[in-house]
Amino acid sequence: QLLEPCGYIYPEFPVVQRGSNFTAICVLKEACLQHYYVNASYIVWKTNHAAVPREQVTVINRTTSSVTFTDVVLPSVQLTCNILSFGQIEQNVYGVTMLSGFPPDKPTNLTCIVNEGKNMLCQWDPGRETYLETNYTLKSEWATEKFPDCQSKHGTSCMVSYMPTYYVNIEVWVEAENALGKVSSESINFDPVDKVKPTPPYNLSVTNSEELSSILKLSWVSSGLGGLLDLKSDIQYRTKDASTWIQVPLEDTMSPRTSFTVQDLKPFTEYVFRIRSIKDSGKGYWSDWSEEASGTTYEDRPSRPPSFWYKTNPSHGQEYRSVRLIWKALPLSEANGKILDYEVILTQSKSVSQTYTVTGTELTVNLTNDRYVASLAARNKVGKSAAAVLTIPSPHVTAAYSVVNLKAFPKDNLLWVEWTPPPKPVSKYILEWCVLSENAPCVEDWQQEDATVNRTHLRGRLLESKCYQITVTPVFATGPGGSESLKAYLKQAAPARGPTVRTKKVGKNEAVLAWDQIPVDDQNGFIRNYSISYRTSVGKEMVVHVDSSHTEYTLSSLSSDTLYMVRMAAYTDEGGKDGPEFTFTTPKFAQGEIE
């Protein structure tokens, strides 16, 4: 059996607008007053179990007390009315939950979309948070007929229960209602066919053309409400390894179609495609992108000949020389296909030319000491590149004309080389480089540069603190010119070890010190200078600086009969390194001198 409460709070379900004032009253029953020997002055108001200050409370009469709250901000408060029975025992009379929030804002930005194969979905912006239970109802009607209401679960969207009818305008609006008010959005009027988002095109396929290596043909299947809609397309593509998409101009794909030829592509390159569609009027929504499909353009003949150079080995006997023809594999962007082989043709004036078919990137031939012309072409499935031509002069011909002002310098983690061209028209330049070392042979790498180039960087994988010997050779129609060389570092470091000093000659007051140059493998940079530090066991240390071209130095004004400690350091642009300490003692007397 439920006990009757001793009184009631009014209102029983209070909802307050945030920031406003609110008053509640507690009315005690007569029977309660008599039973507990109390009146309204015995009432204690509490919010969330905390007593309300007396200033907020008013005793209206012997049965009724009121409490007033100003600027209500808490979203939910437990408000209780309690009495002090027998002057000290607190007894709960009644309790209510006081909610605060806002009336709904007028919904804005109402939009609807018909996802193909699904019912219509409408979305809106409900405005500010109400903090209260708020019902959003999507209303829709024709001029003559109402459709079932759509009760929103989330307050920002609703999917209607009926299938859309196309080519008839519909009116749609949203009603929002909570305990503090009710409001309607502006209505929108549209034909559902103009709100369609088609399903993505599917079965996208890509085929190439043997006739044209710059095109790929696309074909796909569009839905468009089972052919009810004419759709235009949006096509994007990228190379397989690229991250950014290239847009086919939309004006090229405006008319309804299910195939398209993409042009101006690179030969023998894999491209990835995607496609989406929209109603050809442009109304409605773009479909999601189709699944990606890829295809590779057909091969084309190589767009340029390989870089081409030669090295001559010393002749075995006087009549013949061994010539190693060398070339670089073409990058994919120039090979335009799989290189099957290379064709080398050797010719001489009024002689039978001979053709070699080579799969590698070098060919060694025994040639006489006469002048030859070698040509090189790369071949793929489609055809041959243009030929690179090299004149191999007689070894008895002295090469004239070389580059001048040859310089090398590191910049942006690359080793740059620049020069001034010779005064005679050049066909191309050859740059050769290798690591100088006393422990290993100089294994050369090389690259070719066009005649117009006079500044470039070395394209190999270079190491820091290694000394590179760089050679630049201009190549003319008549053959190679003279070669110019220099040394350079990609990045210097302090030497790996310092010089080992020794005495060459020691006198009473001077000593000639000598040292060997640091081996190139330990230099780690250009040795700019040396420092010699010397001291006695009691005296202060003296330091002299010596130019890097020297390998000996005379210390003067030394004390006789004294032990000296000497140490030498070598410096590059990046710092120095000490060598081992060395000691020597000056004699008491000069030669021929007696005590």
């Epitope: 009549e319 010719t347 039978v352």
Partner: nanobody
Framework: QVQLQESGGGLVQPGGSLRLSCAAS????????MSWVRQAPGKGLEWVSA????????YYADSVKGRFTISRDNAKNTLYLQLNSLKTEDTAMYCC??????????????????WGQGTQVTVSS
């Protein structure tokens, strides 16, 4: 300047013989392989035979194998072709040709030309 002068051609009956010579100048004859080629009326150039620079290796087209013999005398800068058992289909202009290396390699492709004036061989009854 390379110069090649052929001689020794003439009119001969089927089954007969001829000896063709090629006098070379303007280059170190002993350093280069040499070939004989021929051109029949209205036909293209056909390689006949080759010999390496030292004379130790010789090569022949199937159509003349066993009938023709190539040789050289490096001291005289002269190339020879002995033609035996001649057939009417051997009728052609015969030329000698200088290679660009000392060896003839049958696996390579060669581009022949007649740089001399050639010598005419006519086999007819």
């Amino acid at each position: 300047q390379v110069q090649l002068q052929e001689s020794g051609g003439g009119l001969v009956q089927p089954g007969g013989s001829l000896r063709l010579s090629c006098a070379a100048s303007g280059f170190t004859f002993s350093s280069y392989a040499m070939s004989w080629v021929r051109q029949a009326p209205g036909k293209g150039l056909e390689w006949v035979s080759a010999i390496n620079s030292g004379g130790g290796s010789t090569y022949y087209a199937d159509s003349v194998k066993g009938r023709f013999t190539i040789s050289r005398d490096n001291a005289k800068n002269t190339l020879y072709l002995q033609l035996n058992s001649l057939k009417t289909e051997d009728t052609a202009m015969y030329c000698c040709a200088k290679h660009i290396t000392g060896d003839y390699d049958p696996s390579l492709r060669y581009e022949y030309n007649c740089w001399g004036q050639g010598t005419q061989v006519t086999v007819s009854s």
